[in-house]
């Protein structure tokens, strides 16, 4: 049992979480994930399952977030705009959108950088997973920083 | 000791700041910051330190985020982009980054606003220092609320 | 009383609300937000006014968040950016900007899509409200998970 | 590529002080952590202080702290070190090391010589009794 986990006592352990951008070969839009670099996984009340999904096990409230950094040109990439999604999939139910930003390309060129955040407090059930899905992740920045997800439980 | 410090006890107060940018006419690429305006710090436990740093005095995991607002023009600034880093010096240790955002430069003259919003969860050590690090200060827009910087413990 | 009241007991209860972006034909500046899709209202210690405020019942430190998304093409617009304002009123005292964000309008057509968030740590007195600003209601995209607005009493 | 030179060593007497310099050149030295390491004779080389690139911060020895202050100057590109009180056992080659501040390893303490990318050539101070 770690310190932040006795902080608050076993009743109400802290629970946060937040991980660090991989990039990957699947072709898969649900971006990866890992623990490295500077990561924070409080206790084993939200684990990273599958490189992709933050689970929780507690029934709450949490504060949720993710930020994407990516790099794209408008003539190489298609007219939509790069949408990062904050999705949840609960037990029993359909995955559903909580958040979404969308940034329209730039025109510099190889490809111009932009960053999106998302954030917002949601009630989570136990088993719920929330993952981040983008329109492109080969267009996703992976160095130092620049893309993590996150959440603190409330 | 004030109302927040009290709100849970002295054993586990509430440890929060937001502080408000200041234009400087130092060369370096940290941010300065002042307690201005509607600025939040809850008691000596976190403490804004030449203007540029909140350093904590206690263990634990906190939500940091900083957000600014800048303008540029493609054409007067560097190929490279305006980047905003959120960094960490922990006693004993080397600086390090912990989230990035990068914006490309805008066409709009003289130039274009663009705003940068970071957040995450990281653990702090006693005596641990956050600042915020831009790529071209002179860019940084200070009109209120535009730019600012806070933490808060979990 | 609902769950997450309850965790904290009665004197300490969780106070959180994230609520979702309406389109509306009102001509005035400050968005409107209803309690639909997945929402937060945690319990009757904050509550959303005339679907544009939310308000607190209790003095303390609160994380206060906004984003907006919105499409807007630099022709079609006035040269000034797309600025979104996280507002504040106190009982007797002036409304007062706590944050802003600014981007300038996109070159793409019909309209660019750009997302801005706003987040920082602020204190509340009972009966304040927090309500959401723009320079142009109409260019807000009002898309699953697009424009959000919520609060979380630390 | 940064190259680092010391000066500034020489002969004092026990209770008397010394300025130490190390001059960066190349790359620009704003972006590089700097330190301060000494060997004494027959010794390992051991952490003096170091100051970060973006802050400033300063980190000592905990044994030397109350008597020795690093600092920068980034516009002369020069690295400091300013010794007071100095004793017989503060005979060693002291030298400047530099490290840049994207360098990540699996180790990022200030303390440890092999988190440096670069290294000065060394200057010998003694202080006779």
């Known amino acids: 049992e770690n310190s932040f986990e006795m902080q608050k006592g076993d009743q109400n352990p802290q629970i946060a979480a937040h991980v660090i951008s991989e990039a990957s070969s699947k072709t898969t839009s649900v971006l990866q994930w890992a623990e490295k670099g500077y990561y924070t996984m409080s206790n084993n009340l939200v684990t990273l399952e599958n490189g992709k999904q933050l689970t929780v096990k507690r029934q709450g409230l949490y504060y949720i977030y993710a930020q994407v950094t990516f790099c794209s040109n408008r003539e190489a990439s298609s007219q939509a705009p790069f949408i990062a999604s904050l999705c949840l999939k609960s037990p029993g139910r359909f995955e559903r959108i909580l958040l979404r930003a969308a940034n329209t390309h730039s025109s510099a060129k190889p490809c111009g950088q932009q960053s999106i955040h998302l954030g917002g407090v949601f009630e989570l059930q136990p088993g719920a997973s929330v993952f981040v899905n983008v329109t492109d992740p080969s267009q996703v920045s992976h160095g130092t920083g620049f893309t993590s997800f996150g959440l603190l439980k409330l | 000791e004030n109302s927040f410090e009290m709100q849970k006890g002295d054993q586990n107060p509430q440890i929060a700041a937001h502080v408000i940018s200041e234009a400087s006419s130092k060369t370096t690429s940290v941010l300065q910051w002042a307690e201005k305006g509607y600025y939040t710090m809850s008691n000596n436990l976190v403490t804004l330190e030449n203007g540029k740093q909140l350093t904590v005095k206690r263990q634990g995991l906190y939500y940091i985020y900083a957000q600014v607002t800048f303008c540029s023009n493609r054409e007067a600034s560097s190929q490279a982009p305006f980047i905003a880093s959120l960094c960490l010096k922990s006693p004993g240790r080397f600086e390090r980054i912990l989230l990035r955002a990068a914006n490309t430069h805008s066409s709009a003259k003289p130039c274009g606003q663009q705003s940068i919003h970071l957040g995450g969860v990281f653990e702090l050590q006693p005596g641990a220092s956050v600042f915020v690090n831009v790529t071209d200060p002179s860019q940084v827009s200070h009109g209120t609320g535009f730019t600012s910087f806070g933490l808060l413990k979990l | 009383e609902n769950s997450f009241e309850m965790q904290k007991g009665d004197q300490n209860p969780q106070i959180a609300a994230h609520v979702i972006s309406e389109a509306s034909s009102k001509t005035t500046s400050v968005l409107q937000w209803a309690e639909k899709g997945y929402y937060t209202m945690s319990n009757n210690l904050v509550t959303l006014e005339n679907g544009k405020q939310l308000t607190v019942k209790r003095q303390g430190l609160y994380y206060i968040y906004a984003q907006v998304t919105f499409c807007s093409n630099r022709e079609a617009s006035s040269q000034a950016p797309f600025i979104a304002s996280l507002c504040l009123k106190s009982p007797g005292r002036f409304e007062r900007i706590l944050l802003r964000a600014a981007n300038t309008h996109s070159s793409a057509k019909p309209c660019g899509q750009q997302s801005i968030h706003l987040g920082g740590v602020f204190e509340l007195q009972p009966g304040a409200s927090v309500f959401v600003n723009v320079t142009d209601p109409s260019q807000v995209s009002h898309g699953t998970g697009f424009t959000s607005f919520g609060l979380l009493k630390l | 590529e940064v190259q680092l030179v010391e000066s500034g060593g020489g002969l004092v007497q026990a209770g008397g002080s010394l300025r130490l310099s190390c001059a960066a050149s190349?790359?620009?030295?704003?972006?590089?952590?700097m330190a301060w390491f000494r060997q004494a004779p027959g010794k390992e080389r051991e952490f003096v202080a170091a100051?970060?690139?973006?802050?400033?911060?300063?980190d000592y020895s905990d044994s030397l702290k109350d008597r020795f202050t690093i600092s920068r100057d980034n516009a002369k590109a020069t690295l400091y070190l300013r010794m007071n009180n100095l004793k017989p056992e503060d005979t060693a080659v002291y030298y400047c090391a530099a490290r840049e501040t994207t360098h990540y390893s699996t180790s990022d303490r200030v303390n440890e010589m092999r988190n440096y990318d670069y290294w000065g050539q060394g200057t010998l101070v003694t202080v006779s009794s």
């Open positions: 190349g790359r620009t030295p704003l972006n590089y952590h």
């Open positions: 100051i970060s690139s973006l802050l400033g911060s300063t």
